[in-house]
Structures are given as structure tokens and as C-alpha cells.
Interface confidence: medium
């Protein structure tokens, strides 16, 4: 009657762990806005399990979402972005789990790029810049970003900074001298929108001079 | 029932202050973004100020801006409006107003009985 | 912010009477409108959102149409206790605001 008989009963179903998590991504592509889901548990049978958001959008009282491997997709211009969502894992008309999301909550930001590093001789410092696409948008304008640097051989000793531009001056004398470094940079929404930190960008390396034995400073 | 109930209004005199509440009831108020509404005498309807379930969505009509506040408690179920420099055309039944965004965007579905602000001198 | 023109301001009808009301928006809102009816004396009522979607429990004999720019409230065969004033109302999402029309009023002629 169901349907579903052949891959195993929805009693069996149920005893399955169905907790999922979601994130946003606000003009993502022009104007539309997308919003990811996936399974906590990698090893759940996603077969015929399908993800649903219902409330606070426009024009329409649910949408149903693309699957794509193992992850759940929309990609929409009819989010709200006020109110709560209700978000539910189905198998047909049958709802397993829902949780109820605000959308501007859970928002991930697209990833800096373009990041780069200038020495300047004079200043000794090094100069970082990146670009991220949310200068452009509507919404998500306001991003914390997070630039993490190591000397190359530390594999796991990162260096974390903070701020709100997309400009960072690193003084030469914190380095170490004749080294090499992997620098990055990720986003999280700051201000009004609430979320999750973006992927890192592509990393950058740059040599530090080594030191100029007489004057004690780096060439 | 679903329901919504206004006090707080009164006669005040221009440029004094007014704190209107909103006490809810009947559903899950942190779920929903609410609204004040007006109506002056022999008029038609006019948005004051809305507030989303969190707080973090605040709008006002030009015509109170900076002068009306829109705040919230959830723990107590209940909305405010904090009205400052009253003016004569501030005198209005004032209503608090459910949004139900399930309905698809700002639908206003639950609507108190409002309560009545006069500014005069 | 959009400006939304209810025509008529006032009608004049029968009971048994087929009425429309139009709500036109000084630019385009999609289908996000939706229409009210209040009483003398009485809180606003929602009937019609989403241009089209009627409102539970409000009789069948009301419908709306419309999008974009132009929006209609229909009562089909009127009954005494329709004659009230009709709003239209649109929103904004971000940021947060509403705009209703000015009103229709529906009298008994």
C-alpha cells in the first residue's frame, strides 16, 4: 500500500537516526538564495528519503528539495528570510523529523578568495588582502573574517587574526625569518545574520626574507 | 484560542511618552514575528512597526521613525511599543497584529481588539 | 516605499449583488497581497493571502486574483453581512515593512 515494503518497513524506518543539518547561502547565484541539508549519520539509507521546507517563504507553502548524492538542495529566490521554516526529512507523505529554522540563522558564507601577500621593504611588514563576494550583496554584507597563518613545517600551529576588513598588516619581526608560510581565510556572518564559517579559501605562500646580519633585520 | 490582548493607551499630552503591551496567548509566540497596526479616528489602516520571532527584524513606518520603538519578550509572551514625542497625529486605536508566515509572507491573521491613544493638549 | 491604490473608495451595491474591488501597486510585488475586511467597531479580518488563497473559514463566495502589479477582491453574490471596508496589504521582507490601501468602502444601496 505504501510502496515502500520493498526497502524495509517505515516501522523500521523510524528507528533510525534521521538528525540533519543545514545551512544557507543568501544570493548565492544573482538573486537566488540556496539552502543545503544532510544527514548527520553518513551511514543512513537515504533511499526514498526526501527533504521538505514548509512556512515563511513567498508565493508558495513548501518546496522540495533536489538531492545530489548525499546532500539535500534549493536553490530559490522565495525564502522570507523572516520566521521560522519548518524543514522536515519525508518518506512519501509520511514526516519523520522536522526541525524549525530560521533561515537567517544558519547562514554560510561563500568562501574569500583572491587572497594574496605584498612584503613591503621599507614598512617591513607583509600586507594580506582578499576579496569576498559579499561586498556586493544585499544581505549578507556584514562578515567577521578569520585569517589563520603557519610557518609551513608547524603543521597544526596556526596563528589566528580577526577582523572586519579584508586588509591585514603582518609586522616582519612576528615572523620567523627565511621561512615559508601558508596563509587563509575564512567568513562568518557578523551584524544582523547569523551562521556558520565559510570553507577556506584557497591558501597563499609566501617566503619571509632571511636577516640581514649587520643592521639584524630581514633582507 | 488564539489570542491577543492590548493595553497601555490613554490620554497624554504632545511630546510625552506612551508605552503600549501586547499579551499573547494561544499559540507559540517565539515563533512568530508580530506587528503594531493603527487606525485613526474615520480613517483606514496604517503599519506602525513590526518586529521578527528574534528580534533581529525591526521595521517602522516613515512616520514614527525614530521617535516609536518595537520590542518583544518571549518569555513573557508579549510585545511592547515604546511611543516617544507623541504627536496629535499619533492618535489612533492601535492594534498588535500575529504574523503568520506559514500563510507565505506577512499575512496578519490574529488581531487584538486594540486599545486607544489620544494625544492632546 | 509602494504605494497601493484600492479603487473604488466606495461602492454601493445590493445584497445578491457580483462585486470586485482592484488594488493596484505603484510597482510590481509578485503575488504578495492579501485582503481584509473590517467592521465598524471591530478588528480587521484576514480573507484572501497569497493574491489567491482564501482564508479558513471565510465563505467560498470571496475569492482574489491578480499579481505583479494589479490585484482583485471578488464577492460573488453579496450577503448582508459583507457590506464593511476591504483592505489590500503588500510587504517588503528586508527590510521589515507593510503598506495597506486606503480602504474600500462597501455600503448597502
Known amino acids: 500500500e505504501s510502496g515502500y515494503a520493498q526497502n524495509g518497513d517505515l516501522e523500521d524506518a523510524e528507528l533510525d537516526d534521521y538528525s540533519f543539518s543545514c545551512y544557507s547561502q543568501l544570493e548565492v547565484n544573482g538573486s537566488q538564495h540556496s539552502l543545503t541539508c544532510a544527514f548527520e549519520d553518513p551511514d543512513v539509507n537515504t533511499t526514498n528519503l526526501e527533504f521538505e521546507i514548509c512556512g515563511a517563504l513567498v508565493e508558495v507553502k513548501c518546496l522540495n528539495f533536489r538531492k545530489l548524492q548525499e546532500i539535500y538542495f534549493i536553490e530559490t529566490k522565495k525564502f522570507l528570510l523572516i520566521g521560522k521554516s519548518n524543514i522536515c526529512v519525508k518518506v512519501g507523505e509520511k514526516s519523520l523529523t522536522c526541525k524549525k529554522i530560521d533561515l537567517t540563522t544558519i547562514v554560510k558564507p561563500e568562501a574569500p578568495f583572491d587572497l594574496s601577500v605584498i612584503y613591503r621593504e621599507g614598512a617591513n611588514d607583509f600586507v594580506v588582502t582578499f576579496n569576498t563576494s559579499h561586498l556586493q550583496k544585499k544581505y549578507v554584507k556584514v562578515l567577521m573574517h578569520d585569517v589563520a597563518y603557519r610557518q609551513e613545517k608547524d603543521e597544526n600551529k596556526w596563528t589566528h587574526v580577526n577582523l572586519s576588513s579584508t586588509k591585514l598588516t603582518l609586522l616582519q619581526r612576528k615572523l620567523q625569518p627565511a621561512a615559508m608560510y601558508e596563509i587563509k581565510v575564512r567568513s562568518i556572518p557578523d551584524h544582523y545574520f547569523k551562521g556558520f564559517w565559510s570553507e577556506w579559501s584557497p591558501s597563499y605562500y609566501f617566503r619571509t626574507p632571511e636577516i640581514n646580519n649587520s643592521s639584524g633585520e630581514m633582507d | 484560542e488564539v489570542q491577543l490582548v492590548e493595553s497601555g493607551g490613554g490620554l497624554v499630552q504632545p511630546g510625552r511618552s506612551l508605552r503600549l503591551s501586547c499579551a499573547a496567548s494561544?499559540?507559540?509566540?517565539?515563533?512568530?514575528?508580530m506587528h503594531w497596526v493603527r487606525q485613526a479616528p474615520g480613517k483606514g489602516l496604517e503599519w506602525v512597526s513590526g518586529?521578527?520571532?528574534?528580534?533581529?527584524?525591526?521595521g517602522y513606518a516613515d512616520s514614527v521613525k525614530g521617535r516609536f520603538t518595537i520590542f518583544r519578550d518571549n518569555a513573557k509572551n508579549s510585545l511592547y511599543l515604546q511611543m516617544n514625542s507623541l504627536r496629535a497625529e499619533d492618535t489612533a486605536l492601535y492594534y498588535c497584529?500575529?504574523?503568520?508566515?506559514?500563510?507565505?509572507?506577512?499575512?496578519?491573521?490574529?488581531w487584538g481588539q486594540g486599545t486607544t491613544v489620544t494625544v492632546s493638549s | 516605499a509602494i504605494q497601493l491604490t484600492q479603487s473604488p473608495s466606495s461602492l454601493s451595491a445590493s445584497v445578491g449583488d457580483r462585486v470586485t474591488i482592484t488594488c493596484r501597486a505603484s510597482q510590481g510585488i509578485s503575488s504578495a497581497a492579501a485582503w481584509y475586511q473590517q467592521k465598524p467597531g471591530k478588528a480587521p479580518k484576514l480573507l484572501i493571502y497569497d493574491a489567491s488563497s482564501l482564508e479558513s473559514g471565510v465563505p467560498s463566495r470571496f475569492s482574489g486574483s491578480g499579481s505583479g502589479t494589479d490585484f482583485t477582491l471578488t464577492i460573488s453574490s453579496l450577503q448582508p453581512e459583507d457590506f464593511a471596508t476591504y483592505y489590500c496589504q503588500q510587504f517588503n521582507s528586508y527590510p521589515l515593512w507593510i503598506t495597506f490601501g486606503q480602504g474600500t468602502r462597501l455600503e448597502i444601496k
Open positions: 497584529a500575529k504574523d503568520e508566515y506559514s500563510r507565505g509572507y506577512y499575512v496578519l491573521d490574529v
Open positions: 494561544g499559540f507559540t509566540f517565539d515563533d512568530h514575528a
Open positions: 518586529i521578527s520571532w528574534n528580534s533581529r527584524g525591526i
